[in-house]
């Protein structure tokens, strides 16, 4: 024991200055009769020692390092010994702060482990053993006064939360309790919360269940989900309110709060949700009207909805097989007549025979949107209805009628664009109620079973922009028939391009006959084809050696042409332009040489 | 001061029927839950029924379930018990109470006395 | 259903003596026990609510302690008017049931 450190703080605050001193027995002077004392911080020498022998031969270090911005460190008094450094005493060193206040404490009893649990929040890192104590006391009043104190209650190493047991509380009856926390460098204490541990009481939620279906129960409407609760038994005499939360299984939906709703109303139905739909339901209650906490949301129930029958319109069109007038394809379109028009499961064709009430023959039940049924030879009506879990829609009645109604007339069709088509026509006289408009490829591939339909409800409409189903470069049938009260007028019909498309190839010239200033050019027309539009008419261009051009416009029925005016013994490039309205496409470059002079014409 | 007064007790003849009433004054009513308990001659007490502050709860013991009916006019301050189908082991002092939030029977009336005998 | 066994029926005891009644739950009750304590012809008298929670004007010579299903009375000195019959009762969940009571009596 040679050297003895003492300091002035072995805890100080974090960047505070410390004082140390180190004294060597004289007794240790055999290691140097002038020993130089060197200090050391963590593993850093430290300059600034000040060095004195004293009157009874010891000799004393002082140090003062002027900030502590360690805050943790061991503080060490050396002497050289060889090449080494020998400790010959040393010194832990804390630096920190005093507790901050503790805040928001807060406490809720727990009435299923008897308890009252508080937790408050420490405040930053002191970087020093700290510890905290709930502190508490019972009082008769407003916690002016103080009554019994309660045992102190301290929390677990590293936890800002403790629990006061059961025996040490009063229920109905004020408590007075505070955090305090106490290191080296101070104590602190938080505000004193004051309460009875009753009005910070956390219940457990009731358990949400679906309600059994009782026979003479109305079904939940569309939207709607009855469901009930089971209250929490222990806290069944507690007034409480409660609230619900829902949202839909899929997709991003928040939670939506139903609320407040009493405890008691131990069943429910909560309605204007979406029919047919999966559900996330979730039940969470608090004392009222007396204060307390909300419990915890209670465990999911998964429930759907009901559907909606489908609240639809069918549109609705028809054809007869001509060989076979009795077999008709019934074709619809259901048009939603709300936003949400429930799902359709199908849909069915019926038939009413008359004289037979109550009866009703199912012609078709199908998911497709059309049908092919034989007409029972007294039927000149059926019904359609689109069905679902929840019912069908109204019915639709589709009447089989001869056409008796007027025309109408000057039926034609233009391209918008490559996917487009605009349909006119003069509306006949009297107005119709609306048309049906088909359309679909024409000749050759023309098929009665690939046709798109629409219709039309305005009966003063003079033309449709057909979108569906369009494709450039094809021809198209385009039907349209006006539909009248009990009947239909004759149907008409009108061939159209979205697109036509140029010319794919010019034909190829040919030299018939040529002479010292002139040339008889002949052509074999492209046969036509579909998809693309007729010929408009040929340029024939020819360009000479010196690079000079000519043309000449000829009509589309020309098969050939003879250039006049050209220099004997000359070179000539010439080529043929096929146009359409939608385009032109040269022809392969034919060359010739005139004749000279002194040569015979060549036929 | 709270105060609960029973009232409605007599001689019944078994299979007969009485409404017993409890008039409640000194505290808030409609916030309460309520009860009904008897006890028989020289034997211990048993609860018969309780209602819940707005009356959508009335929990009963099996030996009155199906019989006995309790109820409450929230306006009037006062509970009530009808007893049906009376047996002669129904013959007991009927207290009425007022509950507690932890489902103590905080105060209680005097009792009234039901005797079922033929 | 909970049933609630009390212990003992009856007991003699002198003015002065420590007294302890016991009550036993079938399952679990957390602390949901309440003591009453009953007069001849009178009505019973709430003395402690859940498991240890003296009714305000009831003595402080009576406490209640425990939890789950063992549960104690004590009456740390018994005093004349204290002769009754003293029964527990559950309230964590319907039927509530009572015990069948103890009847402490004088020696």
């Known amino acids: 024991e040679c050297g003895h450190i003492s300091v002035s703080a072995p805890i100080v605050h974090l960047g505070d200055p410390i004082t140390a001193s180190c004294i060597i027995k004289q007794n240790c002077s055999h290691l140097d009769p002038e020993p130089q004392i060197l200090w050391r911080l963590g593993a850093e020498l430290q300059p600034g020692g000040r060095q004195q022998r004293l009157s009874d031969g010891t000799q004393e270090s002082i140090i003062t390092l002027p900030h502590l911005n360690h805050t943790q460190a061991f503080l060490s008094c050396c002497l050289n010994w060889g090449n080494s450094l020998q400790i010959l005493d040393q010194v832990e060193l804390r630096a920190g702060y005093p507790p901050a206040i503790p805040h928001n404490l807060s406490c809720l009893m727990n009435l299923t482990t008897s308890s009252l649990i508080c937790q408050w929040e420490p405040g930053p890192e002191t970087h020093l053993p700290t510890s905290f104590t709930l502190k508490s006391f019972k009082s008769r009043g407003n916690c002016q006064t103080q009554g019994d104190s309660i045992l102190d209650c301290v929390p677990k190493d590293g936890q800002s939360h403790c629990c006061i047991p059961r025996k040490h509380l009063l229920l109905y009856q004020n408590m007075g309790i505070w955090v305090q926390a106490e290191n080296a460098l101070g104590t602190s204490m938080s505000p004193q919360l004051c309460l009875d541990p009753m009005d910070v009481v956390k219940l457990e939620p009731p358990m949400l269940r679906t309600m059994d279906p009782s026979p003479e129960a109305a079904p939940p409407q569309a939207g709607c989900l009855q469901l009930c609760w089971e209250p929490w038994q222990p806290g069944l005499h507690i007034n409480q309110k409660c609230e619900l939360r829902h949202k839909p299984q899929r997709g991003e939906a928040s939670w939506a709060l139903v609320g407040p709703l009493p405890l008691e109303a131990l069943q429910y139905e909560l309605c204007g949700l979406l029919p047919a739909t999966a559900y996330t339901l979730q039940i969470r209650c608090i004392r009222w009207p007396l204060p307390g906490h909300w419990s915890d949301w209670s465990p999911s129930l998964e429930l759907r909805t009901t559907e909606r029958a489908p609240t639809v319109r069918l549109d609705t069109w028809w054809r007869q097989r001509q060989l076979d007038p009795r077999t008709v394809q019934l074709f619809w379109k259901p048009v939603p007549l709300e936003e949400d028009s429930g799902r359709i499961q199908g849909y069915v064709v019926s038939w009413r025979p008359s004289g037979q009430a109550g009866a009703i023959l199912p012609l078709c039940n199908t998911t497709e949107l059309s049908c092919t049924f034989h007409l029972p030879s007294e039927a000149q009506e059926v019904a359609l209805v689109a069905y679902n879990s929840a019912g069908t829609s109204r019915p639709t009645p589709v009447v089989f009628s001869e056409s008796r109604g007027p025309a109408l007339t000057r039926l034609h069709a233009m391209a918008r664009d490559p996917h487009s088509l605009w349909v006119g026509w003069e509306p006949p006289n009297p107005w119709p109620q609306g048309y049906v408009i088909e359309w679909g490829l024409g000749p050759p591939s023309a098929s009665n079973s690939n046709k798109t339909w629409r219709m039309e409800q305005n009966g003063r409409a003079t033309g449709f922009l057909l979108k569906e189903n369009i494709r450039p470069f094809q021809l198209y049938e385009i039907i349209v028939t006006p539909l009248y009260q009990d009947t239909m007028g004759p149907s008409q019909h009108v061939y159209a391009y979205s697109q036509e498309m140029a010319p794919s190839h010019a034909p190829e010239l040919h030299l018939k006959h040529i002479g010292k200033t002139w040339a008889q050019l002949e052509w074999v027309p492209e046969p036509p084809e579909l998809g693309k539009s007729p010929l408009t008419h040929y340029t024939i261009f020819w360009t000479n050696a010196q690079n000079q051009s000519f043309s000449a416009i000829l009509n589309a029925s020309s098969r050939g042409f003879v250039l006049h005016g050209l220099e004997p013994a000359s070179l000539y490039h010439i080529h043929l332009m096929a146009a359409s309205q939608a385009g032109a496409t040269n022809s392969t470059v034919l060359t010739l040489m005139t004749l000279t002079p002194e040569g015979s014409e060549l036929h | 001061e709270v105060q609960l007064l029973e009232s409605g007790g007599g001689l019944v003849q078994p299979g007969g029927s009485l409404r017993l009433s409890c008039a409640a004054s000194g505290f808030t009513f409609s916030l309460y839950w309520m009860g009904w308990v008897r006890q028989a001659p020289g034997k211990g007490l048993e609860w018969v029924s309780s209602?819940?502050?707005?009356?959508?709860?009335?929990p009963y013991a099996d030996s009155v379930k199906g019989r006995f009916t309790i109820s409450r006019d929230n306006s009037k301050n006062t509970l009530y018990l009808q007893m049906n189908s009376l047996r002669a082991e129904d013959t007991a002092v009927y207290y009425c109470?007022?509950?507690?939030?932890?489902?103590?029977?905080?105060?209680w009336g005097q009792g009234t006395l039901v005797t079922v005998s033929s | 259903d909970i049933q609630m066994t009390q212990s003992p029926s009856s007991l003699s005891a002198s003015v002065g003596d420590r007294v302890t009644i016991t009550c036993r739950a079938s399952q679990g009750i957390s602390s949901y026990l309440n003591w009453y304590q009953q007069k001849p012809g009178k009505a019973p008298k709430l003395l402690i609510y859940?498991?240890?929670n003296l009714q305000n004007g009831v003595p402080s010579r009576f406490s209640g302690s425990g939890s789950g299903t063992d549960f104690t009375l004590t009456i740390s000195s018994l005093q004349p008017e204290d002769f009754a019959t003293y029964y527990c009762q559950q309230s964590y969940a319907y039927p509530q049931q009572f015990g069948g009571g103890t009847k402490v009596e004088i020696k």
């Open positions: 859940y498991a240890s």
């Open positions: 209602i819940s502050s707005s009356g959508g709860v009335t």
């Open positions: 109470a007022k509950l507690g939030e932890l489902g103590f029977f905080q105060e």
